[in-house]
């Protein structure tokens, strides 16, 4: 039975040209995290594997940095970066947990961080 929950940074906004940290946290389970995949809609951004470490997709290498922790840092943001991001936690023995973050990249300086929320 999967008992864990994913806590994410929820809906967030950031300024064009700036950077943002995408962060998820798995709690309420003793399952071992074997791998975390970060995806933007239907594109793989990065993978953090417990044995192999980080793999950043070549097309994102210039703008994506691993960490902090299992999170992901997006740099040199453009308006095209607006959209859904997913952290996919592969765990043993529970299976897969998925968290969702919505990022809005703004032209102006009115960007604010949204509240955290949980996805069971």
């Amino acid at each position: 039975m999967m008992t864990g929950t994913i806590e994410t940074t929820g809906n967030i906004s950031a300024e064009k040209g700036g950077s943002i940290i995408l962060q998820c946290h798995l709690s309420s389970t003793t399952a071992q995290v074997t791998q975390v995949n970060w995806e933007q809609q239907d594109q793989l951004l990065a993978i953090c594997n417990a044995d192999l470490g980080w793999h950043i997709s070549p097309s994102f290498k210039d703008r994506v940095a691993p960490g902090p922790g299992l999170g992901l840092t997006l740099q040199s943001l453009t308006v095209n970066d607006t959209g859904e991001y997913f952290c996919i936690y592969h765990t043993y023995p529970d299976g897969t947990y998925t968290g969702r973050i919505f990022l809005e990249v703004l032209e102006s300086s009115v960007a604010e961080h949204g509240a955290r929320f949980q996805i069971p």
């Epitope: 074997t34 239907d42 044995d51 023995p93």
Partner: antibody, heavy 118, light 107 residues
Framework: EVQLLESGGGLVQPGGSLRLSCAAS????????MHWVRQAPGKGLEWVAS????????GYADSVKGRFTISRDNSKNTLYLQMNSLRAEDTAVYYC???????????WGQGTLVTVSS | DIQMTQSPSSLSASVGDRVTITCRAS??????LNWYQQKPGKAPKLLIY???SLQSGVPSRFSGSGSGTDFTLTISSLQPEDFATYYC?????????FGGGTKVEIK
């Protein structure tokens, strides 16, 4: 240099058993998931089985479930496939393969031929 | 199980031609799609992973695109050593499944 060397193939009668081995070298074997993939003569590729880096998780194609067992010995850098109750349709070249991030197969062995025939 | 359908099953082309092979998944697989090249009597070789990432050491004339259910492998200018069979493979879920293959032959 990454090397995967399969052995143990050969001719076996229907209902018989074989154990394939795959000796790995040139990388940290214990860090990678490993798979077996087969190819019947003149046919396409078919995934057979997978095993996680620490052997905690295994998976099998429906066509071999209950008959084949994948295992590994990280101290010997070796992957195994125990094949029981073999059938004519199991005739194929069997490849062992390295799978980083449980995602893509970046290295394949040269393959070993298993022929099931009376 | 996720079915992978490749087209065409075979094609004839000349050196220098632009070649496109398509692969369709029976359900969305995000970008969990890989492409392999196989020559007779040899093991397959990884060309493209995660739909569009070029494997190290693979010539830049190979490219991949697509997401969801529809994917494409393109060879921008076919070379003599590219005549082979090409397979797509999904790794979104087990059982992992391959397309039926596309044989690229000399015209």
């Amino acid at each position: 240099e990454v090397q995967l060397l399969e052995s143990g193939g050969g001719l076996v009668q229907p209902g018989g058993s074989l154990r394939l081995s795959c000796a790995a070298s040139g990388f940290t074997f214990s860090s990678y998931s490993m798979h077996w993939v087969r190819q019947a003569p003149g046919k396409g590729l078919e995934w057979v089985a997978s095993i996680s880096s620490n052997a905690g998780t295994t998976g099998y194609a429906d066509s071999v479930k209950g008959r084949f067992t994948i295992s590994r010995d990280n101290s010997k850098n070796t992957l195994y496939l125990q094949m029981n109750s073999l059938r004519a349709e199991d005739t194929a070249v069997y490849y062992c393969a390295r799978v980083p991030y449980d995602y893509w197969i970046d290295y394949w062995g040269q393959g070993t031929l298993v022929t099931v025939s009376s | 199980d996720i079915q992978m359908t490749q087209s065409p099953s075979s094609l004839s082309a000349s050196v220098g031609d632009r070649v496109t092979i398509t692969c369709r998944a029976s359900q969305s697989i995000s970008s969990y799609l890989n492409w392999y090249q196989q020559k007779p009597g040899k093991a397959p070789k990884l060309l493209i992973y995660a739909a569009s990432s070029l494997q190290s050491g693979v010539p830049s004339r190979f490219s991949g695109s697509g997401s969801g259910t529809d994917f494409t492998l393109t060879i921008s200018s076919l070379q003599p050593e590219d005549f082979a069979t090409y397979y797509c493979q999904q790794s979104y879920s087990t059982p992992l499944t391959f397309g039926g293959g596309t044989k690229v032959e000399i015209k």
